[in-house]
């Protein structure tokens, strides 16, 4: 039943070219190169991709041709190492080229930058975009792949092909519409937001594999697939988990051709075996490949089988608990996780993994005890506080969100997290807290049964963003500790952090609080970010400021911006009123 067992091929590059087709092959090679060399100009990448493609075609024609037997890492690495400006542009990354495979590829992977120093993507006027699309559709779409891939070096490559297909469809439809902007802009906004979410979700999968290992990823996959496919038997779920782990290991390791090929095979297998997997797959399986794979990945949970028996009989009361644990630890724990997850679509995956970890720890201790059964008899009682903690947290935060609305809820989180980890850079605190705050509008609208999986698994994705950004420039031992100790306990670890009493407040700098008339032309979102940046800086200057003090200063600040943006001479207003505001704020906060 191994989906991925293939005959050995003389030429791996020819094999993948034939499997994927020229269009997907070229797109995936471009994504791979842009994710590795994030600073290289578009034209350079296109040239490299064309050279690789021409080479692949010679191998398709004759698999025995020179160099066709080389591994994809060797071929792609050699090609990347021909870039003339490698040392000037990338510094020590150029040293990777002195290494042999597989060390060279590992070296490239280690130099992927989650926060590359690239300009923000500015959206041109609709007419300009439509002209560019019509003038050269192929280049226009390649540019999209390139710009997303270089900014998101772990973006799930086969899924990026799906985004590009939707991007093309949006332009094809809207550039012919009477009101191009009304048609196109909402579609581009949706793609941007979905793309950011997709990138962040995949980043967590890669972090899970790379920082915590295959076992951690497989545990996550068992829990999630068991919730999604509760009618599938454990053997089926195990097979899907093995195959899915291979796909994500490949994509996270830069093996994008193999990853896309194997993902297509997995979608094919799932659709051929729907009857033993899920009743919800029918519509997905009627779609073309890219849509099909996306649809399967997002498919709703199937209904739980009726009358599932109690877990206690097999996992607590049975005489064979310790025998099972001793004979096949991971399989037995996998079965426990499968059985628990399929009964609890209302739990977050991370909660299910905490329960499985508690069960494992208990058996580890009890199976060595004089009376194992007596020792582990009450193990399910230990689950109660673990379940109640996220339930209570979500209840409290949804109440706060409903009371404040998204912007003010984000501000509350900004203050909370700046006090916990004030050493973290202001842009990171703003970005992460804004995303944490979005949990409200994303999840609080759901009924109780869907709130926890929505909220806590989303928070895991956002906190991983904090972890990967912080890893690049570590500044806080507390962040490092919460990020590295346990993948499933990251959120409880951050929740448990109190105000950092060791933090020495930042020196006051008036420049940080000096604003200009350009703020008036910003979008509402950009204006919010400016205000939230100021709020973080305030807390860094005065970590002991009360909510009331901060609210008063922020209200004054909002009034100041509103007043000066209505003034005839905006710049003068910002200069004069700004000085007054800074003085008043210093007085209010006792700075």
């Amino acid at each position: 039943r191994g989906v991925f067992r293939r005959d050995a091929h003389k030429s791996e590059v020819a094999h993948r070219f034939k499997d994927l087709g020229e269009e997907n092959f070229k797109a995936l090679v471009l994504i791979a190169f842009a994710q590795y060399l994030q600073q290289c100009p578009f034209e350079d990448h296109v040239k490299l991709v064309n050279e690789v493609t021409e080479f692949a075609k010679t191998c398709v024609a004759d698999e025995s041709a020179e160099n066709c037997d080389k591994s994809l890492h060797t071929l792609f690495g050699d090609k990347l190492c021909t870039v003339a400006t490698l040392r000037e542009t990338y510094g020590e990354m150029a040293d990777c080229c002195a290494k042999q495979e597989p060390e060279r590829n590992e070296c490239f992977l280690q130099h992927k930058d989650d926060n590359p120093n690239l300009p923000r993507l500015v959206r041109p006027e609709v007419d300009v975009m439509c002209t560019a699309f019509h003038d050269n559709e192929e280049t226009f779409l390649k540019k999209y792949l390139y710009e997303i891939a270089r900014r998101h070096p772990y973006f799930y490559a086969p899924e990026l092909l799906f985004f590009a297909k939707r991007y093309k469809a949006a332009f094809t439809e809207c550039c012919q519409a009477a009101d191009k902007a009304a048609c196109l802009l909402p579609k581009l906004d949706e793609l941007r937001d979905e793309g950011k979410a997709s990138s962040a979700k995949q980043r967590l999968k890669c972090a899970s594999l790379q920082k915590f290992g295959e076992r951690a990823f497989k545990a996550w996959a068992v829990a999630r697939l068991s919730q999604r496919f509760p009618k599938a038997e454990f053997a089926e779920v195990s097979k899907l988990v093995t195959d899915l782990t291979k796909v994500h290991t490949e994509c996270c390791h830069g093996d994008l051709l193999e990853c896309a090929d194997d993902r297509a095979d997995l979608a094919k297998y799932i659709c051929e075996n729907q009857d033993s997997i899920s009743s919800k797959l029918k519509e997905c399986c009627e779609k073309p490949l890219l849509e099909k794979s996306h649809c399967i990945a997002e498919v709703e949970n199937d209904e739980m089988p009726a009358d599932l028996p109690s877990l206690a009989a097999d996992f607590v009361e049975s005489k064979d608990v310790c025998k099972n644990y001793a004979e096949a630890k991971d399989v037995f724990l996998g079965m426990f996780l499968y059985e628990y997850a399929r009964r609890h679509p209302d739990y977050s995956v991370v909660l299910l993994l905490r329960l499985a970890k508690t069960y494992e720890t208990t058996l580890e201790k009890c199976c060595a005890a004089a009376d194992p059964h007596e020792c582990y008899a009450k193990v399910f009682d230990e689950f109660k506080p673990l379940v109640e903690e996220p339930q209570n947290l979500i209840k409290q935060n949804c109440e706060l969100f409903e009371q404040l609305g998204e912007y003010k809820f984000q501000n509350a989180l900004l203050v909370r997290y700046t006090k916990k980890v004030p050493q973290v850079s202001t842009p990171t605190l703003v970005e992460v807290s804004r995303n944490l705050g979005k949990v409200g509008s994303k999840c609080c609208k759901h009924p109780e049964a869907k709130r926890m999986p929505c909220a806590e698994d989303y928070l895991s994705v956002v906190l991983n963003q904090l972890c990967v950004l912080h890893e690049k420039t570590p500044v806080s031992d507390r962040v490092t500790k919460c990020c590295t100790e346990s993948l499933v306990n990251r959120r409880p670890c951050f929740s448990a952090l109190e105000v950092d009493e060791t933090y020495v407040p930042k020196e006051f700098n008036a420049e940080t609080f000096t604003f200009h008339a350009d703020i008036c032309t910003l979008s509402e979102k950009e204006r919010q970010i400016k205000k939230q940046t100021a709020l973080v800086e305030l807390v860094k200057h005065k970590p002991k400021a009360t909510k009331e003090q901060l609210k008063a200063v922020m209200d004054d600040f909002a009034a100041f911006v509103e007043k000066c943006c209505k003034a005839d001479d905006k710049e003068t207003c910002f200069a004069e009123e700004g000085k007054k505001l800074v003085a008043a704020s210093q007085a209010a906060l006792g700075l």
Epitope: D320, N324, M335
Partner: nanobody, 123 residues
Amino acid sequence: QVQLVESGGGLVKPGGSLRLSCAASGRPVSNYAAAWFRQAPGKEREFVSAINWQKTATYADSVKGRFTISRDNAKNSLYLQMNSLRAEDTAVYYCAAVFRVVAPKTQYDYDYWGQGTLVTVSS
């Protein structure tokens, strides 16, 4: 609790074939190890074959190559296809199940048993 009921036994000539079935009820047993044992008149009950959650099968040397164990989890059933039957295969055949990841070969490891079905191989 799991209840097991065997069927399919009977009289067959040497060299013939039979297919035994075992229907489980009370709870799904797809993750359980399941096995066939047999007891000839005046002899100890002996292991014939077992199958685990992964559908990995093991056999007693005396039946290897002739008997095939299988399971249909959708039907919550276990089967034993017996070919090239010999007189010495005559016995009462029992179906057994236990929640074990690795399928045991010892009768004392099994928690649930059927009542048995008689197989007679005679010309």
